[in-house]
């Protein structure tokens, strides 16, 4: 019996087609992805093959103005239109709290939404009961297939699930659910979830009875043969893991942003064992036409987005200096504003010992593309912010050693004075540079804001300590020459859309007045500073 698994993950509100790098589509003849194009390909496969499942491994939420405006209603509507068979909850599905998941998505989806390792307690237990499930048995042709869901255990640090949801260890939670399905004679089981490729492989190895793992969160691109676009494969598709009980378990993921449709064909014997598996992600490029009816629906929903982007979010009573003459040379108040918004967006009081789990932010000055003038009645709109942050990136959470951060700050000024983008703006960090010293030895003081304290204060950076830092995904991926971040990071979790983070902060504050306040200091001659 042959099953075709079509899968997406980490779509992050790319409902419309995008450019090759998943930012805004500029030249339509070269654009990719989007739900209208995805639907064309899915329908083509459904017509050609008998047993097809369309699955999503989480993080549909968050990523473009679509989510900012429609808050998940767009996800339910278009996933229903594409007739998804099941979805796993990702960490970003909790970005607007549990209510922001229940009302727009859980109550509206015509497909099961799954997670076996999220347990509701207290008053939420009855409210959310039955709205998401640990597993769902689906009819596929004349057979049945069990789908078991899982979600990153790190979600309380990455999103806003509140205090009444407990995120258990994935493997511990999955095993009894899979055992139950086996007891119920369901002999073909897919684990569908959102914990990243390393956990996907562990699930394949450790959870007895799981036949296939369909994952997300780490934006992993797998491919067999010559890859069709810019993504470099992390391994073959499917990635085969040998389980502890000696089975070959295919593990798949399909990069992100709806650029590819994962396509996996599995052959099962009559006892539900996987005999063979093969496939590849399908690049959804312009050779695949956009479905006209879905496209028309997208255009109808688009209208509200254009109206939204010109509405006032809040006011500034100071000039927001985002000029390259400032932000690439010294502390600029636009950089301070953005970093403050980044930290504010990551306030998660999950431990009594810590006022917050993260206090530090770094931001490449070259990523700030425009100032905002206060002499326009002080008005700030989404459109204004899109000029400041035009790249459609995310503000991510990483864990780094102090020594890596020190290297990053050396890199920040290694060729100071040439208006290069790597000059870092900061939050929760005080840095002093001596630019008369040779490159690679210019950081003379680096103090960071404590987290395990009731009164936040600045302490010298410790080289061997592990710190959490919020930064643009561009930096986490080694952009602007920050190779040391990419090479040495200990953990990387994708965050919220950059513009969304700043717009939410401005709406929350109502009136802003960021100052230049001595976070970054530089001098061109020797002072008596001690090295740390």
């Amino acid at each position: 019996w042959e099953l075709t698994i079509l899968h997406t993950n980490d779509v992050h509100s790319r409902l419309e087609q995008t450019s090759e790098d998943s930012s805004k589509c500029v030249n339509a003849s070269r654009c990719m992805g989007g739900v209208a194009r995805l639907f064309t390909k899915v329908q083509q496969i459904r017509r050609a093959e008998p047993n097809v499942l369309l699955l999503d491994a989480g993080d549909q939420y968050q990523g473009t103005i679509w989510f900012t405006v429609y808050k998940g209603a767009e996800v339910a509507h278009f996933m229903n239109a594409l007739r998804y068979d099941a979805m796993a909850l990702g960490n970003h599905e909790f970005d607007n709290g549990v209510e922001g998941l229940i009302e727009p998505l859980l109550k509206e989806a015509k497909f099961p939404i799954l997670s076996a390792n999220i347990k509701a307690k207290g008053p939420l237990a009855s409210q959310i009961s039955g709205l998401y499930l640990p597993y769902k048995v689906l009819p596929v042709g004349d057979e049945v297939v069990g789908i078991v869901g899982y979600t990153s255990k790190e979600t309380p640090f990455l999103s806003n699930p509140g205090t009444n949801l407990v995120f258990e260890d994935e493997i511990t939670a999955l095993q009894p659910e899979v055992d139950k399905l086996k007891t119920l004679n369901v002999n073909k089981i897919i684990a569908l979830g959102h914990s990243g490729f390393e956990m996907d492989k562990l699930i394949a190895q450790k959870v007895r009875g799981v036949d296939v793992v369909v994952g997300g969160h780490s934006n992993t691109f797998l491919y067999t043969g010559n890859p069709p676009s810019k993504e470099v494969p992390a391994g073959k598709y499917p990635f085969i893991v040998t389980s502890d009980d000696g089975r070959k378990v295919p593990v798949v993921q399909a990069y992100a942003f709806g650029k590819y449709l994962g396509y996996l064909k599995i052959e099962f014997d009559e006892r539900g064992n996987v005999i063979s598996s093969h496939g590849n992600p399908i690049l959804l490029n312009s050779s695949i036409p956009e479905d006209p009816s879905i496209k028309a629906d997208i255009n109808k929903w688009r209208i509200k987005l254009d109206n939204y982007s010109t509405q006032e979010l809040g006011k500034t009573i100071v000039y927001l200096d985002g000029s390259s003459q400032s932000c690439r040379f010294r502390e600029c108040n636009m950089g301070n504003l953005i970093c403050d918004a980044m930290i504010n967006n990551n306030l998660r009081h999950t431990d009594e010992m810590f006022w917050n789990h993260v206090s530090m932010c770094i931001l490449n000055g070259g990523g700030i593309r425009s100032p905002i003038d206060e002499r326009n009645n002080g008005t700030i709109t989404w459109e204004n912010l899109a000029a400041v942050l035009p790249f459609g990136g995310t503000f991510d959470l990483v864990q780094l050693k102090g020594s890596t951060l020190k290297k990053a700050f050396e890199h920040s000024v290694h060729r100071y004075g040439q208006s290069t983008g790597e000059f870092l703006q900061v939050g929760g960090i005080h840095v002093v540079y001596d630019l008369s010293r040779k490159p690679g030895d210019r950081v003379v003081k680096l103090d960071v804001l404590c987290t395990k304290c009731r009164v936040p204060s600045y302490d010298p950076l410790k080289m061997d300590e592990v710190y959490k830092v919020i930064l643009p995904n561009f930096l986490a991926n080694g952009g602007d020459g920050f190779q040391m971040i990419k090479d040495e990071l200990l953990r990387h979790d994708s965050g919220d859309q950059d513009i969304n983070v700043v717009s939410t902060y401005i709406s929350k504050m109502k009136v802003i007045y960021p100052a230049v306040e001595g976070r970054i200091k530089a001098h061109h001659h020797h002072h008596h500073h001690h090295h740390h």
Epitope: L133, K136, P139
Partner: nanobody
Framework: QRQLVESGGGLVQPGGSLRLSCAAS????????IGWFRQAPGKEREGVSC????????YYADSVKGRFTISRDNSKNTVYLQMSSLRAEDTAVYYC?????????????????????WGQGTLVTVSS
């Protein structure tokens, strides 16, 4: 082989009663949400009544509330639908369906999601 077999259908006069049975083989019914659905000629299939395995909670479509009663006997691996005060509009093929997923009885009956196991159906005709 897993099977759901419905029985008890037939011809009955308006106002009369019938009891439908759904016998399960190859199923541990305790773990399943079971539903009765019906399809009248030229109409969509609709959920009539559903019962859970664990807490025995039930759901009834508005059109049958107070007239139909769903029950289950796990020792016999059978679910029943007692139908009384039958009307002409109750004429349909009645299907039994089962889902081992922990869906609510309401979600099962709507049905919100595809249901994996179905019987062949039994015809109920209400006519004078």
């Amino acid at each position: 082989q897993r099977q759901l077999v419905e029985s008890g259908g037939g011809l009955v006069q308006p106002g009369g009663s019938l009891r439908l049975s759904c016998a399960a083989s190859g199923f541990l019914l305790d773990y399943y949400v079971i539903g009765w659905f019906r399809q009248a000629p030229g109409k969509e299939r609709e959920g009539v009544s559903c019962i859970s395995g664990s807490d025995r909670s039930t759901y009834y479509a508005d059109s049958v509330k107070g007239r139909f009663t769903i029950s289950r006997d796990n020792s016999k691996n059978t679910v029943y639908l007692q139908m009384s005060s039958l009307r002409a509009e109750d004429t349909a093929v009645y299907y039994c369906a089962a889902d081992p997923s922990p869906v609510t009885v309401q979600a099962m009956c709507l049905p919100r999601f595809p249901v994996p196991y179905w019987g062949q159906g039994t015809l109920v005709t209400v006519s004078s």
